[in-house]
Each structure stands twice: as structure tokens, then as C-alpha cells.
């Protein structure tokens, strides 16, 4: 017998469905209605036929009582080709739910998203994560999606984007967004970062993650942040091949005084890069290629410095910097 596509745990907390049949029995997902955390993977199926079965224009208020009874707080939908109209229909219905975190991964969104009707209510998400989602509408996708969300979004993560730059003039501000993660967009680069960080649309950002995004120098990132008026408290530039030296012709960039934590681990650095902020609470330089202990004048004023996993560090040697958090044990880098 073929295994059931969905599995609900004994606590009714987590439910995972993997639909791999060409014509899946979607009713199997019903058992997930009592779960808090739901994952549905559609095996790469085209969900276009669903449009014939559902009335995407129906008033979602007719489902309000049922949807309010759902316990789902975290929903992941993956591996499907989804008509924009169907996505919108789902968002309209889910607006009546208690859903807080939505993850979309490995999706191809086809067609354009209609505008939000006047009487419609947006989805009150706190977290939206997108990974490898392509949109037929190109650069305007974020603005189109944003209109279906209430303005309280706190966490936005966009990985493996086909169009990581946004149509900034169409995007409204994200007043509550404190964490923006653009990691795993290796083609982004510093110019792309400037295009993605729409000026003054992200006024509340505290945490900015740019792992594996094709960044080249901390100074270049500083310039992009300054241009956008983004002042994070914490910045993650790990897993980028960073150059330690700054282009002499490039203007010097003043880091925001708000920045207190900088992650430069796994960045291939052979020396401490120039142009770092003058003062930091946390600086992570672990798993680089530093062949000697950094001199005090090369480093910012820093409370917690991590240098683990660099070649110069042999277990048992003296800690290279006051206030360091090094364990003396070389981690797996």
C-alpha cells in the first residue's frame, strides 16, 4: 500500500503533507485542520485545475467561522505552480485565521494578482518567508503581495529570488518590519542591494541578514545602507567572499551608530577589512583565513570578538584580544 501523504503528530501540533501523485487526493490534508504548524508540499504540481473547482471571487466571509476555528499559526506551502488568483483566494480566506507565519518555497506564481477589494481585510502576518519563488509580474511582485497583508509584518525573508530588486515606487513602507533577510541571493551584489533596499520603506529594521549575497566589501554595504536610510542594529555579512581592502577612489562611509553587531564569519578574509565601524558590541571574524592575530589598531572598539577557526589560532595560545569569546577550540569551518 502507498504511504498516506499526510501525517499529523499525536499532539495535533504539526502536520506535514507530501503530495507526489499526479492526481492527489487533497482531502487527505483535512487532518491538518487541527494542527498549529502545517506543511504542504505539492510535488511540483500545477494547481491551475483548482481554479475550476473553487470560486476565487466568492465572498470569503462565508468561510469566516470555519477558518477562525483553525489552530494553524505557521503554514508552509511548497513545490507547486500556483495561479496568482488562487494565491489571492487563499490569502483572502486566511485573513480570517490566526495564521502568523507563512512560508512559500519552490513556487512558480503565474498570472497577475488582482488589487485588494475595498471590503477585503488583509492577512495579519508577523513573518513571511519566501524561498525560490518566481513571479510572473517581475519586479512589482512585492507591492502586489504587500497589499494583501496588514502593515504589521515583523520578519521578511526572501531567498533564491528570481527578482530580488523591487519596484520601489509601488512598494509601501513596512512600518513594523524589524528583520529583513535577503540571504542566499548570490547574484544580488552591492548594486542589487541598493535596488532592493527601497529608500525609507524599511524604517524599523534592526536585523539585516545578507549571507551569501555577493557582497564584496563592508564599505560597499555601508554605502547601500546609508543610501536607503536603513540603520540596523545587527548585520550579517557571513558567507560572502569579502575583500579586506577598500577601493581608494570610493568615498569613505560612515556607519550608523545604531549598528552594534557585525558578523563577518566565513568571508575568506586574510586580514581585518578596512572601513569597519569604530565601535561594536559584537564582531564575529570566525572561520576566516587570518594568518596573524589582528592588531588593536586594526580592530574596532569591541566588547565581544570571535576569532575561532582562523589559521593563526592554535588551541592553547593566548587570547588575541581583550574581551574575546574564543574557546581555544577550532570549530569545524
Amino acid at each position: 500500500t502507498t504511504p498516506e501523504p499526510c501525517e499529523l503528530d499525536d499532539e495535533d501540533f504539526r502536520c506535514v503533507c507530501n503530495f507526489s501523485e499526479p492526481q492527489p487526493d487533497w482531502s487527505e490534508a483535512f487532518q491538518c485542520v487541527s494542527a498549529v504548524e502545517v506543511e504542504i508540499h505539492a510535488g511540483g504540481l500545477n494547481l491551475e485545475p483548482f481554479l475550476k473547482r473553487v470560486d476565487a471571487d466568492a465572498d470569503p466571509r462565508q468561510y469566516a467561522d470555519t477558518v477562525k476555528a483553525l489552530r494553524v499559526r505557521r503554514l508552509t506551502v511548497g513545490a507547486a505552480q500556483v495561479p496568482a488568483q488562487l494565491l489571492v483566494g487563499a490569502l483572502r480566506v486566511l485573513a480570517y485565521s490566526r495564521l502568523k507565519e507563512l512560508t512559500l518555497e519552490d513556487l512558480k506564481i503565474t498570472g497577475t494578482m488582482p488589487p485588494l477589494p475595498l471590503e477585503a481585510t488583509g492577512l495579519a502576518l508577523s513573518s513571511l518567508r519566501l524561498r525560490n519563488v518566481s513571479w510572473a509580474t517581475g519586479r512589482s511582485w512585492l507591492a502586489e503581495l504587500q497589499q494583501w497583508l496588514k502593515p504589521g509584518l515583523k520578519v521578511l525573508s526572501i531567498a533564491q529570488a528570481h527578482s530580488p530588486a523591487f519596484s520601489c515606487e509601488q512598494v509601501r513602507a513596512f512600518p513594523a518590519l524589524t528583520s529583513l533577510d535577503l540571504s542566499d541571493n548570490p547574484g544580488l551584489g552591492e548594486r542589487g542591494l541598493m535596488a532592493a533596499l527601497c529608500p525609507h520603506k524599511f524604517p524599523a529594521i534592526q536585523n539585516l541578514a545578507l549571507r551569501n549575497t555577493g557582497m564584496e566589501t563592508p564599505t560597499g554595504v555601508c554605502a547601500a545602507l546609508a543610501a536607503a536610510g536603513v540603520q540596523p542594529h545587527s548585520l550579517d555579512l557571513s558567507h560572502n567572499s569579502l575583500r579586506a581592502t577598500v577601493n581608494p577612489s570610493a568615498p569613505r562611509c560612515m556607519w550608523s551608530s545604531a549598528l552594534n553587531s557585525l558578523n563577518l564569519s566565513f568571508a575568506g578574509l586574510e586580514q581585518v577589512p578596512k572601513g569597519l565601524p569604530a565601535k561594536l558590541r559584537v564582531l564575529d571574524l570566525s572561520c576566516n583565513r587570518l594568518n596573524r592575530a589582528p592588531q588593536p589598531d586594526e580592530l574596532p572598539e569591541v566588547d565581544n570578538l570571535t576569532l575561532d577557526g582562523n589559521p593563526f589560532l592554535v588551541p592553547g595560545t593566548a587570547l588575541p584580544h581583550e574581551g574575546s569569546m574564543n574557546s581555544g577550540v577550532v570549530p569545524a569551518c
Epitope: 499526510c6 499525536d10 495535533d12 483535512f30 476555528a69 483553525l70
Partner: nanobody, 115 residues
Framework: QVQLQESGGGLVQAGGSLRLSCAAS????????MGWYRQPPGKEREMVAQ???????NYGDSVKGRFTISRGNARNTVYLQMNNLKPEDTAVYYC?????????WGQGTQVTVSS
């Protein structure tokens, strides 16, 4: 191991009613989603009705408005009230309990609707 026992099937005239019952016994530590499925002669098994642990229901298109699924007071008992029965409702009706690791199915009860 969980056992499911269906009852209430039988022969009924078109337009008539039947009430199926299903009782679950064995190692069940929480209220689980349950459902009724049917297999008409020579056809695939299909979903008839489902009920979640919190009482949310779902019905197959062909039975909407005629069949009602409900839970009993006992922890994992489920009923299927079938009204306005049609000859095409003739099938073996199975009860199902959604359970982590391996779902449990009953042996089935025959429902025959004569015209």
C-alpha cells in the same frame, strides 16, 4: 493497536435514511480526526465525510447537504447520518481514524440503496 468497528449498514429504499456508527478502541491517547469513506462496486475508494478533533467537518461533493458527520460523547466515536439516499450511494462504507505512523481503517459496512 487501534480497532475500528462500523455498524448501521443495510438495505434501504431510495429517499430513505440510515445512520452509521463507528467506535474506536485500543491505544488512542487524544481525540483524532476521523472520516467516512466508501467504495462503490468496481470503483475506487472515495472520501465521504471527515471531522477534525475540534469538530470542523468536510464533505465529498456528491453528499453535501444530504449526509452529516458528527462525533459522539465517547472519545473516538463518529456517526454518519445519511438522508435522501440514492442508488449511487450503494457502497461499502469504511470508517477511518487518522493516526500518527499508520492510519486505522474499519472492516466496512455494506449500504445498499434500491430504486
Amino acid at each position: 493497536q487501534v480497532q475500528l468497528q462500523e455498524s448501521g449498514g443495510g438495505l434501504v429504499q431510495a429517499g430513505g435514511s440510515l445512520r452509521l456508527s463507528c467506535a474506536a478502541s485500543g491505544r488512542i491517547f487524544s481525540i483524532r480526526p476521523m472520516g467516512w469513506y466508501r467504495q462503490p462496486p468496481g470503483k475506487e475508494r472515495e472520501m465521504v465525510a471527515q471531522i477534525s478533533s475540534s469538530g470542523i467537518t468536510n464533505y465529498g461533493d456528491s453528499v453535501k447537504g444530504r449526509f452529516t458527520i458528527s462525533r459522539g460523547n465517547a472519545r473516538n466515536t463518529v456517526y454518519l447520518q445519511m438522508n435522501n439516499l440514492k442508488p449511487e450511494d450503494t457502497a461499502v462504507y469504511y470508517c477511518r481514524l487518522f493516526k500518527t505512523g499508520a492510519d486505522s481503517w474499519g472492516q466496512g459496512t455494506q449500504v445498499t440503496v434500491s430504486s
